[in-house]
Amino acid sequence: SPEPGAPSRSRARREPPPGNELPRGPGESRAGPAARPPEPTAERAHSVDPRDAWMLFVRQSDKGVNGKKRSRGKAKKLKFGLPGPPGPPGPQGPPGPIIPPEALLKEFQLLLKGAVRQRERAEPEPCTCGPAGPVAASLAPVSATAGEDDDDVVGDVLALLAAPLAPGPRAPRVEAAFLCRLRRDALVERRALHELGVYYLPDAEGAFRRGPGLNLTSGQYRAPVAGFYALAATLHVALGEPPRRGPPRPRDHLRLLICIQSRCQRNASLEAIMGLESSSELFTISVNGVLYLQMGQWTSVFLDNASGCSLTVRSGSHFSAVLLGV
């Protein structure tokens, strides 16, 4: 008889057939699982209270242009030893200059600009997703230039400002991902190739689904955008009765595949092979890796039962994917 067939190329794109959402898992409401990762928002990331920042600056305003002593040359590291006895009170100093708020604001902007520069030096590529981009843009008109002294004096202010402003590159938003489980047991006859389908979205903490493309009924995940996808499948397998009740032969094995367009050899695929000669009646087989999918290409999970006995893939076995990047 013919071999269980092959893989392929890019195809005519069509919308997935109906059934993209159904069936739902046990106890899952129409609105979908309750536990879902929150959508990241720009507002929530790196929030710095403007008033707190300003007040800190004003409290530190005896430094910088208001400093009693302008440091020259390199910044000196502060060394803290044992405190000495209190000295005599010094003479009354001359009244300090009245610094108008505009000047304070200008220096505050300079400090912010320095923080942004520090962030840019620390990052190999500028990050456009965080708030630093807009801040830097808004500071562009400031005409004063910060000298070396300013860099030295404002270390503690920078420490406060640079931390929320430049925590390093933000993790990118995941645009496409899912975790689904097999709804019911699937029987796989001996010497047969079986494509898994009929999944559900678990209503559980940590489960996720983001973006379109997953057809729960067909078991096919159609890439919503072209890119690198991390894919994984874990099957819980129960061995059935072998014919003539013989033990598994040394050549008996299972192949678990995640394939593109139902073409496991012609296209790149992920594959795990497991010998059955020493396996127990219930075991797990897993495969994971990364595939590049064109937009509209689909992937699905296949189990090739190259053994002499039938087996059952248990419900709860799972299939997942995450778009890593484009």
Epitope: P4, G5, A6, R11, L193, S262, R263, C264, Q265, D304
Partner: antibody, heavy 119, light 106 residues
């Protein structure tokens, strides 16, 4: 038994249409690509197109666009090719063939349907 | 589209003779398949993935090649091998067949 069943022959009038069937049995019809090929008497094989029963995706040979339409009925495990505006050039044997999944190429062929276009 | 040229169009061989059928592609292909078709019957998968024998194909058959040049070889031809052999490429749409080589046994 894994097989593809096709009617033996059909006679049609010029200008008419005909829908050829290919009934699959012995395997999971929806998982495999189904292809159609044409062979004129004494000549070679021409690939018409392919359809995936589960996804509904199709690809055609440009030469047969407007001539051949591929469809499936998953409830009866049957693939169809609809040939329109028939002329004598369409007189040929039409084969359905299953593409393998873990190998490359057609791993199973139907016996073919002979289409005769004649008035 | 990729054009496949088979040669010779007709070949006559005596039993026990070694026979090589060739298939030349107009541009490079990754996989070449061969199908066998006997008169009045449907094609059968014969060699796939360039060199793998389909189930039931005698070991005297072999396939090889890469790029634009592929071949099917019968180490010691037998009477039952009389048929037309087509090469077919799977690298790009539309999938194309060669014109076929008709093998006759003397």
């Amino acid at each position: 038994q894994v097989q593809l069943q096709q009617p033996g022959s059909v006679l049609v009038r010029p200008g008419a249409s005909v829908k050829l069937s290919c009934k699959a049995s012995g395997y999971t019809f929806t998982s495999y690509w189904m292809h159609w090929a044409k062979q004129r008497p004494g000549q070679g094989l021409e690939w018409i197109g392919e359809i995936h029963p589960k996804s509904g995706d199709t690809n055609h040979n440009e030469k047969f666009k407007g001539k051949a339409t591929l469809t499936v009925d998953t409830s009866s495990n049957t693939a169809y090719v609809d040939l329109s505006s028939l002329t004598s050039e369409d007189s040929a044997v039409y084969y359905c063939a299953r593409e393998g999944i873990t190998t490359v190429g057609f791993d199973l062929w139907g016996a073919g349907t002979t289409v005769t276009v004649s008035s | 589209q990729i054009v496949l040229t088979q040669s010779p169009a007709i070949m006559s061989a005596s039993p026990g003779q070694k026979v090589t059928l060739t298939c030349s592609a107009s541009s490079s292909v990754s996989y070449m398949n061969w199908v066998q078709q006997k008169s009045g019957t449907s094609p059968k998968r014969w060699i796939y993935d360039t060199s793998k024998l389909a189930s039931g194909v005698p070991a005297r058959f072999s396939g090889s090649g890469s790029g634009t040049s592929y071949s099917l070889t019968i180490s010691s031809v037998e009477a039952e091998d009389a048929a037309t052999y087509y090469c077919q490429q799977w690298s790009s749409h539309p999938y194309t067949f060669g014109g076929g080589t008709k093998l006759e046994i003397k």
